[in-house]
Each structure stands twice: as C-alpha cells, then as structure tokens.
Interface confidence: low
C-alpha cells in the first residue's frame, strides 16, 4: 500500500504503533548516524572565490547545542589575482535543519522541535541587474 | 562538575531507560518557512559553480522532501560563460537533523536521524599536488 505523506490525516496506523498523547509525538533520541563523518574538500571556505568565515552559536537548551553559521567575507568575489571583483557577488547558501529546544517548566522538562535556517557557505553569482526606466 | 538538575529543588532522577524517548510538542516552531530552494533563490543557475537540484522524497522521514545539489561541472564558469578547468566546482555539505518514523509508518512516533546533504556548490582554487 502507498503511504500518504506527512500531514495527511488518513495515515494508516499499524497496530504496533505506540500510544501517544494528543498534541505530541514520541521521539527516540538515540540518533541514527550520530557518528558519521563529513568529508568536505579541505579548507573550501578559504579556497572559494566567495570565501566565508564560521561562527559557532551556542545554546545549552538546544540540541545540538552548537550550530555553526557561515558568513561571506566579501560583497564581491575573489578574482584570479586575489583581488575582490565587485562586478560579481558572494551570496550565502542556506539549509533548513531541525533542532530540539528544551524548556524548563518547574521540575519538568518539555521539548519543542524547531526549524532553523543555517548558512552553510557562500557561492559566487552574477548579479541581477535591475534597469531603471 | 556537579549535576545541575532542572532547578535546585527537583529530584535527581537517574532512572534512565535505554534507548530514551521524550514526548515532543507536535507543533514545529517555524514549520512554514519556505523549503523549496528553487523557489527561494536562483543562485543554483547564476553561480559560477552552478548546480542542479534533485528531489529526494521519503514518506518515512520529516521533512519528507529534501533537495540535493549536484555540481553541473568539474570546473567553474568564467566571464565568457565557458567552463574554466583551472578552478573546481565543489559541493558544500551540511549535516542536518531529520525525523525518521519508528516503527515505520507510525504517524506520531519518530527517531532523530543525522543526514548529510549537499546544499549547493562553490568555486575553489584546486589543491595542486606536485609530483617529485
């Protein structure tokens, strides 16, 4: 049988599904692929024609606690001579991820899923030129 | 370090079952932000290291649709619109957290999963290895 997409109310529920209180979901926090390695090309943030820096945002009540954000170093792009060429633009590339937020309510802890937008790096683009009439 | 409970008067309950599960509010904060990169910007076409976006769909995952970037060229596009092989287009990868239905097909039971996605491409100077 075809499984309907997330958000469809007619999602067929197998008998093995755990009972869940209304308005909440059961989340197993044993993370699948917890220890996988990111194998990005070396130092691409410095070697890129649209280089970027990383900053770490930190929140002990968020999982993961550390979220790394990239910021483009220049408005333009770096040309073959190593100079900034402002006829081109460095722009951020963004990706959504889920985080879990922990909330302290008295002696209990509650959890809320949150979508956050992470700037992953930068790319060099030809600018869009708006012609004024 | 000292164990810091939720607040000083709270019991320090160490009765932890494994694997541990938590109940999470169904309403995802910022749920309705735009998730289609084709609609959100045309950088994938205008970049000197352009990429194609491939739709990866999995109903057992939330979000069910993830867009994967694949660089179009080995080199980068120069000012003349040609591919310059003195430079390299490389993918920018990011680890993201998604929810995986567990047990499968269950509407409100999930497990966190870390996945690696290619978000876009950037143009880099190659690392040249000189042969002795």
């Amino acid at each position: 049988r075809k499984i309907p997409k997330v958000g469809h109310t007619f999602f067929q529920k197998p008998e093995s599904c755990p009972p869940v209180p209304g308005g909440s979901m059961k989340l197993d926090i044993g993370i699948i692929n917890e220890n996988q390695r990111v194998s990005m090309s070396r130092n691409i943030e410095s070697r890129s024609t649209s280089p970027w820096n990383y900053t770490v945002t930190w929140d002990p009540n968020r999982y993961p606690s550390e979220v790394v954000q990239a910021q483009c170093r220049n408005l333009g792009c770096i040309n073959a001579q190593g100079k900034e060429d402002i006829s081109m633009n460095s722009v951020p590339i963004q990706q959504e991820t889920l985080v879990v937020r922990r909330k302290h309510q008295g002696c209990s802890v509650s959890f809320q899923l949150e979508k956050v937008l992470v700037t992953v790096g930068c790319t060099c683009v030809t600018p869009v030129i708006h012609h004024v009439q | 370090g000292i164990t810091i409970p939720r607040n000083p008067g709270c019991p320090n309950s160490e009765d932890k079952n494994f694997p541990r599960t938590v109940m999470v509010n169904l309403n995802i904060h910022n749920r309705n932000t735009n998730t289609n990169p084709k609609r959100s910007s045309d950088y994938y076409n205008r970049s000197t290291s352009p990429w194609n976006l491939h739709r990866n769909e999995d109903p057992e995952r939330y979000p069910s649709v993830i867009w994967e970037a694949k660089c179009r060229h080995l080199g980068c596009i120069n000012a003349d619109g040609n591919v310059d092989y003195h430079m390299n287009s490389v993918p920018i990868q990011q680890e993201i957290l998604v929810l995986r239905r567990e047990p499968p097909h269950c509407p409100n039971s999930f497990r966190l999963e870390k996945i690696l996605v290619s978000v876009g491409c950037t143009c880099v100077t190659p690392i040249v290895h000189h042969v002795a």
């Epitope: 002990p60 550390e66 922990r102 802890v109 | 370090g1 810091i4 409970p5 160490e14 932890k16």
Partner: antibody
Framework: EVQLVQSGAEVKKPGESLKISCKAS????????ISWVRQAPGQGLEWMGG????????NYAQKFQGRVTITADESTTTAYMELSGLTSDDTAVYYC???????????????????WGQGTPVTVSS | DVVMTQSPDFQSVTPKEKVTITCRAS??????LHWYQQKPDQSPKLLIK???QSISGVPSRFSGSGSGTDFTLTINGLEAEDAGTYYC?????????FGQGTKLDIK
C-alpha cells in the same frame, strides 16, 4: 571521535607545584564536565575534582581543597589541573576524564566518565 | 563520603567461565553506579553506566544489575582479553568515590 590528550610526564621536588593540561577534541567541550582522577602506584582511583565549562564552577574533594585548582579554557578546549605543595604522596598517574551531559533529562553533566585521557605520570622526589 | 566496597579483591578464572563482581555502597545511591575496566598501563574504560545500562562498543557479555546499596557486574563467558582490574564508581553525591578494585586474572 572524542579524544582527551594530556601533557607529558613530570618530575617534581617536594613543595613545588604541578600544572597538567587536558586538550579535548571531537566533542562539544563547553557542555561537558571534565574531572581529574589520580592513581597512586599499585592503588585504586581517587577523584580530585571537576569543572563544567558552561557553568565555570569547579568542585573539589575535601582532601584536596585549598591545594588544587581546576580551570578550563573554552577557546582552546583545554582543561587544567594545578596541585600545589607537592609531597611524595602525590606521586601518581593523573587522568582527566569527560562527564557527558544529559540534555534530554535536563542535566548539564551526569557524572559517569565516558572518555579518559592517556594519563600523566607524576613523580615527586627530592 | 560514600564508601564503596568491592569483593573479591582478586579472582583467578578460566576462560568461558561466568564471573561476578559485587560492589556495596555505605548508603543508598539509587542507580548512580558505574563500572570501569582498567588494563595494565592503560586508562580506565567505561563498561556499564547507571547500574545496568550498556555502553556502545562494549561486548554484550558485560552486564550490570542492582540498585540502592548492592550492585553486581557479571561477565558471561570470560575471554582472555578481559584480564585487568575492575572498579565501581558512585556519582550520587560529591565527592565521587570508587571501589578499591577487583583484579581479574585469567588462568
């Protein structure tokens, strides 16, 4: 992979001070606790104290109070243990050990030691 | 301070045997009891946390049980590589305290 790398072996004279470092990599240094545990030759394990970088506070065993100082430098992800007024009884292998945090139950550190440094042998002799 | 007492101090066992090491706390420590293995000239290694919780990468022959004041570490089907000293550790109150250790020798 999480690694704790400690500074090298030390030879000290009685009355001198000792400072050992423990460099952490492969984990979120700030949210974990780092404890120091020592082991005298042929003896068992003895906890000296620990620090949770995010809280910035250290706790010490009564036996070492006033003689030990544990600090952490977040910028270099390094913890330090300083022991003053050394005597021959302080001859031991000194270990740093990581205390993981427990985000899901609301705790910053949970006190069991999941990763250990390789140990720093210290000899105190005149 | 919470005093942790292990028994036996020393045990000589043949491979494939079942080994039991006990640890007694001088007061109720709930389930905040952890077990470590230490081989000669090596750092201790976490085997079991919170009395009975297994640790990723640790062979399934190691198991733990108990709560309150009495705890047990069991090795089902001892292997030659299990030789070393085993320590229990309580973390319910500061200071952390360890048992005196149980040296396990393989015949």
């Amino acid at each position: 992979e999480v690694q704790l790398v400690q500074s090298g072996a030390e030879v000290k004279k009685p009355g001198e001070s000792l400072k050992i470092s423990c460099k952490a990599s492969g984990g979120s240094f700030r949210s974990y606790g780092i404890s120091w545990v020592r082991q005298a030759p042929g003896q068992g394990l003895e906890w000296m104290g620990g620090i949770t970088p995010i809280l910035g506070t250290a706790n010490y065993a009564q036996k070492f109070q006033g003689r030990v100082t544990i600090t952490a430098d977040e910028s270099t992800t390094t913890a330090y243990m300083e022991l003053s007024g050394l005597t021959s009884d302080d001859t031991a292998v000194y270990y740093c050990a990581r205390e993981p945090n427990d985000f899901w139950n609301g705790y910053y550190t949970t006190h069991h030691f999941d990763y250990w440094g390789q140990g720093t042998p210290v000899t105190v002799s005149s | 301070d919470v005093v942790m007492t292990q028994s036996p101090d020393f045990q000589s066992v043949t491979p494939k045997e079942k080994v039991t090491i006990t640890c007694r706390a001088s007061q109720n420590i709930g389930s905040a009891l952890h077990w470590y293995q230490q081989k000669p000239d090596q750092s201790p290694k976490l085997l079991i946390k919170y009395a009975s919780q297994s640790i990723s990468g640790v062979p399934s022959r190691f198991s733990g049980s108990g709560s309150g004041t009495d705890f047990t570490l069991t090795i089902n089907g001892l292997e030659a590589e299990d030789a070393g000293t085993y320590y229990c550790h309580q973390s319910t109150s500061l200071p952390h305290t360890f048992g005196q250790g149980t040296k396990l020798d393989i015949k």
